[in-house]
C-alpha cells in the first residue's frame, strides 16, 4: 500500500515537472497561434521587396514591385523595424520566415531563385539581429517552392 | 531575345569522352538555371539535371551520376555537358535549356557513339 | 523520384477542334510544371511555365491550368501548325522529370 502511494506521488511529481518544463519551453518559443497572430499583424512587404532586391538586382522580369523606388539598405532595415514587432522567438521568426517564401513563392520563376531566395531568407535575421531559426522548414505551398 | 546555341554534332568510338557547349546570349546567364535533357532516336525527352549558374552547383537525374558532368564559364556566357566513357546507348541529341520566364531550348547537339 | 504521366499518348483531332491533354504527377509540386511542344527534327519549344504562363509569342489559344498533381493543357481551336508532340515537365528543385509526351496527329 505504501509503495503504491509512493509510486503515485513519483509519477504527479514527474507530470508536475514535465508540464513546467513544457511551459518553460513553449515561452521560450513563443507560443504557436500567438506567433500567427503576430505574423499576421506586421507587414512583411519590406522583408519581401528587401529580399528580391538582391536576388533580382536590377533585373526587368521582376516588375510585380517598383523595386528600384526604394534602396536596398532602407527596405532591410524598414523589414528589420517590422519583424522587431514580434516577439524574438526562434518559433515567431521561423513563421515569419515561411509566411515571406508562401507569399512570393509564384513571383519565383524558377528552382534557381527558389534556392538563393531561401538563402537570402535564412540570412534575414542575422542580419537584424534576430535570433535565427536553428530548423525552419521553408518548403512551403505542398512542399514545392 | 534569349538565345541558346549549342556545339556542332560529334561522332565518338566507345570508350572516348566529348563535351559539349551550350552558349547563352540575351540576357544575364547567372540568374536561371540550366538543364540538360537527352532524347535517344525515336524516344522522349529524358532530363538529366540541372546547373545553378550563380553557384555553379550541378544537380543530376538518376541515371546521370559518375559519366556525366554538367560545369560553366561565366566569362563566355557558356555552359558544358562532358560525357566520358562513351557506351551505344548515349547516341543521342543533347539539350540545353533555360528554365523560367523566357524559357527557351538550344538547337540540339547530336551524339553518335558507333566502332 | 517524381513521376509524371500524360494522356492520352495519341490524340487524333480536326483542325478547329478543342484539344485537352492531362498531366498528373505522382505527388503535390505546386504550380512547378511546364510545357512544351516539339515537332518531328526540331527542338522543342516552350509553350507554358509555372503551370499558367504563356510563354511570349505564344498563341493565346494554348492554356495551362491545374496546380498540385493534376495538369491540363487546352488548345480551343486546334491549328494546321499545332500538330506535334506534346510533354508536360515538373521543374521542382531537385528534380525535372517530362511526362512520356502526347501525339497529336491528324484525324
Known amino acids: 500500500m505504501a509503495k503504491s502511494t509512493i509510486l503515485v506521488a513519483l509519477l504527479a511529481l514527474v507530470l508536475v515537472a514535465h508540464a513546467s518544463a513544457m511551459r518553460r519551453e513553449r515561452g521560450r518559443q513563443g507560443d504557436s497561434s500567438s506567433c500567427e497572430r503576430q505574423v499576421d499583424r506586421v507587414n512583411l512587404k519590406p522583408c519581401e521587396q528587401h529580399i528580391m532586391q538582391r536576388i533580382m538586382g536590377e533585373q526587368e522580369q521582376y516588375d510585380s514591385y517598383d523595386i528600384r523606388s526604394t534602396r536596398s539598405s532602407d527596405q532591410q532595415q524598414r523589414c528589420c523595424d517590422e519583424l522587431n514587432e514580434m516577439e524574438n522567438t526562434q518559433r515567431c521568426m521561423c513563421e515569419a520566415l515561411q509566411q515571406i517564401m508562401e507569399n512570393q513563392c509564384d513571383r519565383l520563376q524558377d528552382r534557381q531563385m527558389v534556392q538563393q531566395f531561401k538563402r537570402e531568407l535564412m540570412n534575414l535575421p542575422q542580419q537584424c539581429n534576430f535570433r535565427a531559426p536553428q530548423r525552419c522548414d521553408l518548403d512551403v505551398s505542398g512542399g514545392r517552392c | 531575345q534569349v538565345q541558346l546555341v549549342q556545339s556542332e554534332s560529334e561522332l565518338k568510338k566507345p570508350g572516348a569522352s566529348v563535351k559539349i557547349s551550350c552558349k547563352a546570349s540575351g540576357y544575364d546567364l547567372t540568374k536561371y538555371a540550366m538543364n540538360w535533357v537527352r532524347q535517344a532516336p525515336g524516344q522522349g525527352l529524358e532530363w538529366m539535371g540541372w546547373?545553378?549558374?550563380?553557384?555553379?552547383?550541378?544537380t543530376y537525374a538518376q541515371g546521370f551520376t559518375g559519366r556525366f558532368v554538367f560545369s560553366l564559364d561565366t566569362s563566355v556566357r557558356t555552359i558544358y555537358l562532358e560525357i566520358s566513357n562513351l557506351k551505344a546507348e548515349d547516341t543521342a541529341i543533347y539539350y540545353c535549356?533555360?528554365?523560367?520566364?523566357?524559357?527557351?531550348w538550344g538547337q540540339g547537339t547530336l551524339v553518335t557513339v558507333s566502332s | 523520384d517524381i513521376q509524371m504521366t500524360q494522356s492520352p499518348s495519341t490524340l487524333s483531332a480536326s483542325v478547329g477542334d478543342r484539344v485537352t491533354i492531362t498531366c498528373r504527377a505522382s505527388?503535390?509540386?505546386?504550380?512547378?510544371l511546364a510545357w512544351h511542344q516539339q515537332k518531328p527534327g526540331k527542338a522543342p519549344k516552350v509553350l507554358i511555365t509555372k503551370a499558367s504562363n504563356l510563354e511570349s509569342g505564344v498563341p493565346s489559344r494554348f492554356t495551362g491550368s491545374g496546380s498540385g498533381t493534376d495538369f491540363t493543357l487546352t488548345i480551343t481551336s486546334l491549328q494546321p501548325d499545332d500538330f506535334a508532340t506534346y510533354y508536360c515537365q515538373q521543374y521542382t528543385t531537385y528534380s525535372g522529370t517530362f511526362g512520356q509526351g502526347t501525339r497529336v496527329e491528324i484525324k
Open positions: 546547373i545553378n549558374t550563380n553557384t555553379a552547383k550541378p
Open positions: 505527388q503535390n509540386i505546386g504550380r512547378w
Open positions: 535549356s533555360r528554365d523560367g520566364s523566357g524559357a527557351s
